[in-house]
């Protein structure tokens, strides 16, 4: 069976991942402008998040608005949306069955049962991460595919905000965390008994000399 | 020399359909977008549409998308466009434009002009 | 989509005087901004893009400035080949949009 260390480093790993992937959530970062005018005083920066955009002026004042319904966000985004939503759902399933198998809780006694559970942990943590690597990719290709494209206007140019990092660093951590879970093998049961029955087997016999 | 030659001026029929085309010379055609612009008399200047000869990717201006098909042919470095439904109010001068190699939506070079008069 | 608003549509102006010729766009449209001219007949001609850089070709006499909302073409001497039809477009963002013109016309 894999070390405590081992379980008790993927399952942090994995714990970890899953805030990143409530911060990426969060965030209004996913798509930045920067728009920069003939002088530093028009300038402003215009952030892009999945329930908010936010305008940054140059004096550092900053106005947030809530999107109005969920067609005002554009469908790459709202897809990423749902897709994180689901990932948060999941790796909280995971983290779930994580304190579930561990080694030093008590909710299972049977050893193999926990080894088991873990491993699902971990599949359950590596579902999470992927399931946040590939809208935060997506996003990123097509604000890469669009500020090379020439019939996409200045305007309409986008850079990759904060929250798409974030998101890679969560997806790395959940499926960092998720594999060492998976290598967390079931006891080996070569033994057809266990070592107490036989004992006291051949106590008893001895019995019969 | 770059240059963008146009076809000549056409006199069509309500509800019928019209190609024109924008041959270009002097440059490597597939290097810039094409852009098409109207004119109509004694008016400004309307966008129509654009598109990449690269790889045939269009962008259309509201108003313009059912009315008018942007093609390209490579072969022949020609750019084209198709109006259809035509009514009076689609008479006027289709100019093909270049965009600006760093700021495609300018236009640094312009055909002629190809005159559409729609007539009974 | 953005307005372009060139307040005067028409100008009398004589040769040797300097005119300028104003554009307002309804948004900020980031110096991404260029100036045809057009003579009766013929089609548009590339002046300025990028609101200030004047295009190869272009006489010295013609200027560009401005940032924001708010831009100029200036000409400081007016020539009788100058006498045309001047139009601003913006390019900041999809569909590009045009002034209505400034007519020059002479006294």
């Known amino acids: 069976m894999a070390s405590m260390g081992l379980q008790v480093m993927g399952i942090a790993l994995a714990v970890l991942g899953w805030l990143a992937v409530m911060l990426c959530c969060a965030l209004p970062m996913w798509r930045v402008t920067a728009f920069i005018g003939s002088n530093i005083v028009t300038s402003q920066t215009i952030w892009e998040g999945l329930w908010m955009n936010c305008v940054v002026q140059s004096t550092g004042q900053m106005q947030c608005k809530v999107y109005d319904s969920l067609l005002a966000l554009p469908q790459d985004l709202q897809a990423a949306r749902a897709l994180v939503i689901i990932s948060i759902i999941v790796a909280a399933l995971g983290v779930l069955l994580s304190v579930v198998g561990g080694k030093c809780t008590n909710c299972l006694e049977d050893e193999s049962a926990k080894a088991k559970t873990m491993i699902v942990a971990g599949v359950v943590f590596l579902l999470a991460g992927l399931m946040v690597i590939v809208p935060v990719s997506w996003t990123a290709h097509n604000i890469i595919q669009d500020f090379y494209n020439p019939l996409v206007a200045s305007g309409q140019k986008r850079e990759m905000g904060a929250s798409l990092y974030v998101g890679w660093a969560a997806s790395g951590l959940l499926l960092l965390g998720g594999g060492l879970l998976c290598c967390n093998c079931p006891p080996r049961t070569d033994k057809p008994y266990s070592a107490k029955y036989s004992a006291a087997r051949s106590a008893a016999a001895s019995n019969y000399v | 020399e770059v240059q963008l030659q146009q076809s000549g001026p056409e006199l069509v029929k309500p509800g019928a359909s019209v190609k024109i085309s924008c041959k270009t010379s002097?440059?490597?055609?597939?290097?810039?977008?094409r852009h098409w612009v109207k004119q109509s008399r004694g008016k400004s200047l309307e966008w129509i549409g654009t598109i990449n000869p690269n790889n045939g990717e269009t962008r259309y201006n509201q108003k313009f998308k059912g009315k008018a098909t942007l093609t390209v042919d490579k072969s022949s470095s020609t750019a084209y466009m198709e109006l259809r439904s035509l009514t009076s109010e689609d008479s006027a001068v289709y100019y093909c434009?270049?965009?600006?190699?760093?700021?495609?939506?300018?236009?640094?070079?312009w055909g002629q002009g190809t005159s559409i008069t729609v007539s009974s | 989509d953005i307005q372009m608003t060139q307040s005067s549509s028409s100008f009398s102006v004589s040769l040797g005087d300097r005119v300028t010729i104003t554009c307002k766009a309804s948004e900020d449209i980031y110096n991404r901004l260029a100036w045809y001219q057009q003579k009766p007949g013929n089609a548009p001609r590339l002046l300025i893009s990028?609101?200030?850089s004047l295009e190869a070709g272009v006489p010295s006499g013609f200027s560009g400035s401005g940032s924001g909302k708010d831009y100029t073409l200036s000409i400081t001497s007016l020539q009788t080949e100058d006498v045309a039809t001047y139009y601003c477009?913006?390019?900041?963002?999809?569909?590009?949009?045009f002034g209505g013109g400034t007519k020059l016309e002479l006294k």
């Open positions: 477009q913006q390019y900041w963002s999809t569909p590009p949009t």
């Open positions: 002097g440059y490597t055609f597939t290097e810039n977008i």
């Open positions: 434009t270049r965009g600006i190699t760093k700021s495609p939506y300018g236009m640094d070079y």
């Open positions: 990028g609101a200030t």
